[in-house]
Amino acid sequence: WSSKVLMSSANEDIKADLILTSTAPEHLSAPTLPLPEVQCFVFNIEYMNCTWNSSSEPQATNLTLHYRYKVSDNNTFQECSHYLFSKEITSGCQIQKEDIQLYQTFVVQLQDPQKPQRRAVQKLNLQNLVIPRAPENLTLSNLSESQLELRWKSRHIKERCLQYLVQYRSNRDRSWTELIVNHEPRFSLPSVDELKRYTFRVRSRYNPICGSSQQWSKWSQPVHWGSHTVEENPSLFALEA
């Protein structure tokens, strides 16, 4: 499963999709066994996982994945060189950073090697499929007696490409207060009560300048500020996902 296979053809993503027939489509029976959909996510622009539901296959089948970019030098499909497995059956492909081109149409082909006509070609805009790492190094500092500033860092992705969701609440609050912060990894809370204990957390997404990803990162580790003498209701500090 580690070999790279090149399937050469001009205009591959168009030509490979054709059924050589002059019969009108309504007379063609729909494929009896549709292939599972491929779902791809680019993790922090470090690697990409393209996965499919291998258990949807009626028989254990090692499906193969080939990919290419719409605008590429050699216009060839390349086989996955690092398959992911579920119960010893292929269920995904991991693609490394060098092979990720965010701003070219990504063409992915899933195929049953036993039945070459069982093939599905999908097209994806990878810039809409980026999931950043959770923000790190959350630090709190006092700007003034009652004003707090929260700062954080994001690894490997330019700050201007990210949008942040900040949530905070005090030990007296039943729900989070949340706000969107665009592109700048800091936020200030103008008025805090030093008799309360505050919890802050942040997550990020690749949106809207460099991409349109709807997927948020995981939440950062929470940070706390304020009185440690206040009696706290532990249930209020259960951080829901």
Partner: nanobody
């Protein structure tokens, strides 16, 4: 079951425009990837354009910049706006639908589509 009905085809002079419609009945389009394909007499069926229900659209190189794919989910209709038509665009145009779980899935392979319309004839005269 999804029924697809195309309309909007016709005879047009080279350089002209047409707008094709694909109306669906029986099911909302909100979880379907949609595609347009065409077939000229004696030719292979050809991918024209496709989209995902998340809003990504893709085009064959031969139509890029001239054709625009759009959908109106409220009306359960997809459209293909065709501008600067050329005689080589003459074909029967088919609309197709494929149920998908993921908002980002767009299929350019005809064998990925479960549902097809009857087609509408587009003739471009020189």
């Amino acid at each position: 079951q999804v029924q697809l009905v195309e309309s909007g085809g016709g005879l047009v002079q080279a350089g002209g425009s047409l707008r094709l419609f694909c109306a669906t009945s029986g099911r909302t389009l909100s979880r379907y990837a949609m595609g347009w394909f065409r077939q000229a007499p004696g030719r292979e069926r050809e991918f024209v354009a496709c989209d995902s229900w998340g809003g990504d659209t893709f085009y064959a190189d031969s139509v890029k910049g001239r054709f625009t794919f759009s959908r109106d989910s409220a009306k359960n209709t997809v459209y293909l706006q065709m501008n600067s038509l050329q005689p080589e665009d003459t074909a029967v145009y088919y609309c197709a639908a494929a149920p998908t779980s993921f908002a980002t899935t767009a299929y350019s392979s005809s064998n990925s589509y479960a549902y097809w319309g009857q087609g509408t004839q587009v003739t471009v005269s020189s």
